[in-house]
Interface confidence: medium
């Protein structure tokens, strides 16, 4: 579709005559109409096969034709085409005398013809408009034209149809061949699809519109490239949404389990080496001088009580030195200048001579000790608690309190943690050390089974090591039912399971 | 053609008959204008049909369709709320520019959801 | 959304000079297009397009209309203006989907 454009510009008939020979009067009234068609090698009459126009009277005689004349007609002239300009034409350009207001060809005089003109030729498209000038024995005209494509149509025929949008169809303006030209931030065929952010996942996020980065589920961060990791996921990480691969140190199904105590709480004081002795325990070695459970306490060499016999101990840079009561003497009192008439015994002990009567022994009552019985009797200093429990002296006996786990008169018992039933929606619940494991059924999550779990999150196989993937609702969680010897959430840890599991 | 009084939450469809220009050449499109809210677009149909695109507070309510055999635009409206209150205008999109910036307008509808 | 701000109306005196203007919340140049169209309503008809890409008359809009500007401002001149102008008159954005359109100027005489 276009437009075949003719510009009028300048009519000289100077005598004011028609092709005739006879003279108008007063002088001749000029219109033209103009015929436009195919190629032909001869122009020779027959339709107008591209179309005709005619104008109003655009003057008498001689006169020049300006731009959008003030007769009412259209200057340039438009002769409109809805077919492939074929790149060839033929014109006709004829001047008329009309002498009254009636200009159709049947109200005219048959000699009202001023001049006629023809001429064809090849026309290619395009803006430049072509200047002609035809003469004859007594006029001359001098017109241009030119052949433009309508609104919207393109190429060197006028053939190509492009409507620039900007809408939900496209985001597109034309280029002079017609082709599409992407507004900023589309592509496509039709320029319909966003450019999302620069660097946004392929896979992972989205556009709706350029420059953005949606994230699909499971995913997360500016570019969508960072998983979401399972849901209350605490020392852990993900490869793939939903995970939970727990940190080095961690474990369960959580990695909320903390298996190196040390590293995490470094609980250890003054230079003691931690070692790790279980889930949430540990043991310090102590450096000479220190002593404590976080080997926390500055070791006194009084502390020992290495002065017997009531004598006291005086702490020094290099050591300690005994300062012995009357009738004692030795590094550590341990020598006695006492007899039976002496009463050395103390808290209610028992005089015995030895030695026909140089020396004695004191037999002590119960809860005292010591050659005099000076001391009360620590219950606690054989260590008595086990599995870390504290001793406490509670006068004449002694009691251990126990760390969480443990019960007995020596802590020695392990508590039962599943006695309480623990595990959720049917789950079977094991003792570990310290602490309980529950195994889910099928469609529950958790450390006691208490999350449901979503059915397309086992879609991408995300068990290990032969485990069982069940899911549920929300359609966004799995778990994994771990095989002998395998834990976490994936199943991914190989573990020496106690043998007291039931298994 | 179709407007007039309806009840909230019933239905009712609007017509709009195209002529003057090649309707199956042309995307779509209603708009509609109340006193309050002024002039909202509404929906669009692309020109063969197959793509279709809704204002958020209609979308799943409001259904766009044509019969290009019979140059024809509809609006099927369900669940229809008070705040719908409108006088309905069917028109060519204007994604697809008509040659020398012509456009087609329907005359309007005017539809009321009252109870 | 874009949206589209016009002061609610404006006072005119026959044969002289009308300025309406529209102001977007965000540019509606694209790639040197302006994306604005400008509508006429009169009372009880359909809206009328008179200007579009800001700066083009549509077919049969005489030439006393006339559109200019570009980014967010965009301005609709009636020069002069004639008594069959007192209408309403919205502009509208097709920069981005959904299309917004103004809140309208009414034209009222002085």
């Known amino acids: 579709s276009g437009v075949f454009q003719l510009q009028l510009q300048e009519f000289a008939n100077e005598r004011g005559v028609l092709a005739s020979g006879r003279r108008c009067e007063p002088g001749c009234r000029t219109f033209f109409r103009v015929c436009l068609k195919h190629f032909q090698a001869v122009v020779s009459p027959g339709p107008c096969t591209f179309g005709s126009v005619s104008t109003p009277v655009l003057g008498t005689n001689s006169f020049a034709v300006g731009d959008d004349s003030s007769g009412g007609g259209r200057n340039p002239l438009q002769l409109p085409f809805n077919f492939t300009w074929p790149g060839t034409f033929s014109l006709i350009i004829e001047a008329w005398h009309a002498p009254g207001d009636d200009l159709r060809p049947e109200a005219l005089p048959p000699d009202a013809l001023i001049s006629k003109i023809a001429i064809q030729g090849s026309l290619p498209v395009g803006q430049k408009w072509l200047l002609d000038e035809q003469t004859s024995p007594l006029t001359r005209l001098r017109y241009s034209y030119r052949v433009i494509c309508s609104d919207n149509y393109y190429g060197d025929s006028c053939s190509r149809l492009c409507k620039k949008r900007n809408d939900h169809f496209g985001h597109y303006v034309c280029q002079p061949d017609g082709s599409l030209s992407c507004l900023p931030g589309w592509t496509g065929e039709y320029c319909e699809q966003p450019v999302c952010l620069s660097g946004c996942h392929e896979q992972n996020g989205y556009c709706s519109k350029p420059a953005e980065c949606i994230c699909r589920p499971g995913w997360q961060g500016r570019l969508c490239n960072e998983c979401i990791p399972h849901n209350g996921c605490r020392h852990g990480t993900c490869s793939t949404p939903w995970q939970c691969t727990c940190d080095e140190g961690w474990g369960g199904l959580f990695c909320d389990q903390d298996l190196n105590y040390c590293t995490h709480h470094s609980p250890c004081k003054n230079g003691a080496t931690c070692s790790n002795s279980g889930q949430r325990s540990y043991t310090c070695t102590c450096r000479p001088g220190y002593t404590g459970v976080d080997c926390e306490l500055e070791l006194s060499e009084c502390d020992s009580n290495p002065c017997r016999n009531g004598g006291s101990c005086k702490d020094q840079e290099d050591g300690y030195r005994c300062l012995c009561p009357p009738g004692y003497y030795g590094l550590h009192c341990e020598h006695s200048t006492l007899t039976c008439a002496d009463s050395p015994c103390f808290n209610g002990g028992s005089c015995q001579e030895r030695n026909q009567g140089a020396s004695y022994a004191c037999e002590c009552p119960p809860n005292f000790t010591g050659s005099n019985c000076e001391k009360k009797v620590d219950r606690c200093t054989s260590n008595p608690c086990a599995n870390g429990g504290q001793c406490l002296n509670r006068g004449p006996n002694r009691v251990c309190r126990c760390r969480p786990g443990f019960t007995g008169a020596h802590c020695e018992l392990h508590i039962s943690d599943c006695a309480r039933s623990p595990c959720a929606h049917g789950g079977t619940c094991h003792d570990l050390e310290t602490g309980f494991v529950c195994t889910c059924p099928a469609g529950f999550s958790g450390r006691r089974c208490e999350v449901r779990i979503p059915t397309e999150a086992c879609a991408s196989g995300p068990c290990l090591n032969g485990a069982t993937c069940y899911t549920g609702l929300p359609p966004d969680n799995f778990v994994c039912n771990c095989p002998y010897g395998f834990v976490g959430s994936r199943c991914e840890f190989p573990v020496s399971m106690p043998p007291s599991f039931p298994w | 053609s179709g407007g007039g009084l309806v009840q909230p939450g019933r239905s009712m469809k609007l017509s709009c008959a195209a002529s003057?220009?090649?309707?199956?050449?042309?995307?779509m499109a209603w708009v509609r204008q109340d006193p309050k809210k002024g002039l909202e677009w509404v929906a669009t149909i692309s020109y063969d049909g197959r793509s279709t695109y809704y204002r958020d507070s209609v979308k799943g309510r409001f259904t766009i369709s044509r019969d290009n055999a019979k140059s024809t635009l509809y609006l099927q409206m369900d669940s229809l709320r008070s705040e719908d209150t409108a006088t309905y205008y069917c028109?060519?999109?204007?994604?697809?520019?008509?040659?020398?910036?012509?456009?087609?307008w329907g005359q309007g509808i005017s539809v009321t959801v009252s109870s | 959304d874009i949206v589209l701000t016009q002061s609610p109306a404006l006072a005119v005196t026959l044969g002289q000079r009308a300025t309406i203007s529209c102001r977007a919340s965000q540019s509606v140049t694209i790639s040197n297009y302006n994306l604005m169209q400008w509508y006429q309503q009169r009372p009880g008809r359909q809206p009328k397009l008179l200007i579009y890409d800001a700066s083009n008359l549509a077919s049969g809009i005489p030439a006393r209309f006339s559109g200019s500007g570009s980014g967010t401002d965009f301005t609709l001149t009636i020069d002069p203006v004639q008594a069959d102008d007192i209408a309403t008159y919205y502009c509208?954005?097709?920069?981005?989907?959904?299309?917004?359109f103004g809140g309208g100027t009414k034209l009222e005489l002085r």
């Open positions: 028109k060519d999109y204007d994604g697809h520019y008509h040659p020398y910036g012509m456009e087609a």
């Open positions: 509208q954005q097709s920069r981005d989907d959904p299309r917004t």
């Open positions: 003057g220009f090649t309707f199956s050449n042309y995307d």
